[in-house]
């Protein structure tokens, strides 16, 4: 008789990534009987919520429910109704909410409260909304990419199932760039992690990992830009800021109140004789790079070596996956190819930033001007952060892999977060069992 497939025994999970600039909802799926196997969870849907990050709703919390509706309804459609009540939903908020909490714990609690009320009305198993720490964000990003790359599997393969896979079990480091923070996480080579705050110990699938991680709050691409503007306006002679990080011919008016709204610019705050100033782009990569470097304090280091701002950083080791805004920005600039050297990236950035704004607008007519205008800054910032901030070199640049997805799942902290909260990463290696035939009769 012919084998007939029974209804698949699968489980689902939902994670909302409430970032500083936007919120994304991810739906994951896995075979119920293989929960402890490595690499079985995969992303089946990503839904980007229309609008800004949740921290921007602080004065309009009544709009949060509507804001989340479309993506939550999408989840309701994608996940079979019979599974709704067993599907966990987690919301993790990152640096945008960390910054809001620094300003006012009450306001951050208010936003989270209304987010939770809204999400609890859906028929899923809502497990709460919380602000994750920078350390968690780094750690879960590292877990995600290594889980998807098959690095936790003890079975060595003679063939490669995913891109970037070298056949060894050496884990990849994780480089994550958001709007408000950036994380660096990797396993150093036989190096003591000199600052306890940056040390993580994991036992995953029977193997111990000593992991270094740090999250630089205010060094995401959007907050870094605010920092740079606040620093540069200090020395401007009038209300015109000639800015090398924007294309020649670009003009934009900035409110001083907006500039000083974020805790990230507090160190540069001063009384200015004007309420607004105008950015006038001059499009010069080298000058932009120099201006960005002034955001990194490298004069002080209480350890054997540091990244910047006195933060310990061990010598870089192995390959790195660079994801989130590292990938989105470099993808836009067409610089994600493994074959593009660091020198070539720098050359292309010089050319790109020097292009007149009118020309750029014509070439990328489909791209929102707000985003389009900032690629010169963002690309230059990525180079500055990786080279001067994290000490990558022209030689070690080839160890950076700009990754958007692995095996169809987005690189980022959300998958690792869910794997941890659903206890799907065992400390010990599961006993290998014969292949299950239970799905056939």
């Amino acid at each position: 008789t012919q084998n007939k497939a029974l209804p698949e025994n699968v489980k689902y999970g939902i994670v909302l990534d409430a970032g500083s600039s936007h919120t994304s909802l991810y739906i994951y799926k896995w075979p119920a009987e293989k929960e402890n196997d490595t690499g079985v969870v995969h992303q089946v849907e990503e839904c980007r919520v229309k609008g800004p990050g949740i921290s921007k709703f602080v004065q309009k919390v009544n709009e949060i429910g509507i804001y989340l509706t479309d993506c939550m309804e999408r989840a309701r459609e994608v996940i079979p109704r019979s599974q709704h009540q067993e599907t966990p939903v987690y919301l993790g908020a990152t640096a945008g909410m960390r910054l809001l909490r620094m300003e006012s714990e009450e306001l951050a609690d208010r936003v989270l409260d209304v987010v939770e009320r809204s999400l609890s009305n859906y028929p899923f198993d809502f497990q709460g909304a919380r602000i994750i720490t920078g350390q968690e964000e780094g750690a879960y990003g590292w877990i995600t990419i290594n889980y998807l790359l098959g690095k936790f599997s003890q079975k060595t393969r003679w063939f490669s199932i995913v891109p970037y896979e070298t056949n060894n079990q050496e884990t990849f480091g994780a480089l994550d760039l958001g709007g408000a923070s950036t994380q660096v996480t990797f396993v150093p080579q036989n190096q003591t992690i000199e600052s306890p705050d940056n040390a993580l110990q994991f036992r995953l699938y029977g193997k111990d990992y000593n992991v270094y991680t740090h999250s630089f709050l205010c060094y995401g691409k959007d907050q870094a830009l605010w920092q740079k503007l606040a620093k540069d306006i200090q020395v401007a002679s009038n209300e015109i800021l000639r800015d090398p990080c924007f294309h020649p011919g670009y003009k934009k008016v900035v409110n001083v109140s907006d500039l000083y709204k974020t805790p990230c610019t507090k160190r540069f705050e001063m009384t200015l004789p004007f309420q607004q100033f105008e950015i006038q782009g001059i499009g010069n990569y080298q000058q932009c790079h120099q201006s960005i470097l002034e955001l990194f304090n490298t004069s002080y280091c209480p350890y054997s070596q540091c990244a910047f701002n006195g933060i310990f950083l061990p010598p870089l080791q192995g390959d790195f996956g660079a994801f989130s805004a590292f990938y989105f920005v470099m993808k836009f600039l067409n610089l994600t190819s493994e074959k593009v050297s660091q020198e070539k990236v720098t050359e292309m950035m010089k050319k790109f930033c020097a292009q007149p704004w009118e020309e750029i607008k014509t070439s990328y007519a489909g791209v929102k001007e707000k985003y389009l205008s900032e690629y010169c800054f963002s690309g230059t910032y990525i180079l500055s952060l990786l080279l001067q901030g994290y000490h990558f070199t022209a030689d070690s640049w080839e160890h950076i892999h700009f990754i958007g997805k692995i095996q169809g799942s987005d690189a980022g902290w959300t998958l690792g977060y869910m794997l941890n909260l659903t206890n799907m990463i065992p400390a010990e290696q599961p006993l290998s069992t014969p292949l299950s035939h239970s799905t056939y009769v």
Partner: antibody, heavy 121, light 107 residues
């Protein structure tokens, strides 16, 4: 000081609806939530739903979803709980209770005296 | 939803004695747990929140402890006005849920 004053006892027929009110007397509602909790005769406490009057954001226990509606009128500092399709099992004392704060502070620091709703044919 | 289980259902204690009431959550609620006292014909009254913080005006003989899934309310020396029903409530996640209650009666 603020007190939560609830409307009087109600006797209702099965299948009908009841609307219970809860007014902040001697002040206004804080900006935090107001929950409704019921207690059937001789039974324990059961949370039904909540609203933040200032924002109109309501949420409900799955058990009551579609059958309960919580609204607020900020101008009169009153919160309402309407329960429809009543059945005999809905016979209970219905309390409104003030939440002490946002997010993880959702315990009840002030309670109304309760409204007895009897559902009987 | 988080299921809250209280034990014992009834506790018989003599005045002046110590009473220990337990509350267990079906999953971790960290320290987000409150205790209430309810007397016949009255609304509940908040005693403890955050697992161990006494509410305003609550006598020192009432104390709460625990975190995660296991919690305890202790009444160090029972007074006549303490004979009542006690409920625990988790305030970590929606839906907010209560335990079934423990009746403290005179022995």
């Amino acid at each position: 000081q603020v007190q939560l004053v609830q409307s009087g006892a109600e006797v209702k027929k099965p299948g009908s609806s009841v609307k219970v009110s809860c007014k902040a007397s001697g002040g206004t509602f804080s900006s935090y939530g107001i929950s409704w909790v019921r207690q059937a005769p001789g039974q324990g406490l059961e949370w039904m739903g909540s609203i933040i009057p200032q924002f109109g954001t309501a949420n409900y226990a799955q058990k009551f979803q579609g059958r309960v509606t919580i609204t607020a009128d900020e101008s009169t500092s009153t919160v309402y709980m309407e329960l429809s399709s009543l059945r005999s099992e809905d016979t209970a004392v219905y309390y409104c209770a003030r939440e002490a704060g946002y997010y993880r502070y959702r315990y009840f620091d002030l309670w109304g005296r309760g409204t007895l709703v009897t559902v009987s044919s | 939803e988080i299921v809250m289980t209280q034990s014992p259902a009834t506790l018989s204690v003599s005045p002046g004695e110590r009473a220990t009431l337990s509350c267990r959550a079906s999953q971790s609620v960290s320290s987000n747990l409150a205790w209430y006292q309810q007397k016949p014909g009255q609304a509940p009254r908040l005693l403890i929140y955050g697992a161990s913080t006494r509410a305003t005006g609550i006598p020192a003989r009432f104390s709460g402890s625990g975190s995660g899934t296991e919690f305890t309310l202790t009444i160090s020396s029972l007074q006549s006005e303490d004979f009542a029903v006690y409920y625990c409530q988790q305030h970590a996640l929606w839906p907010l849920t209560f335990g079934g209650g423990t009746k403290v009666e005179i022995k």
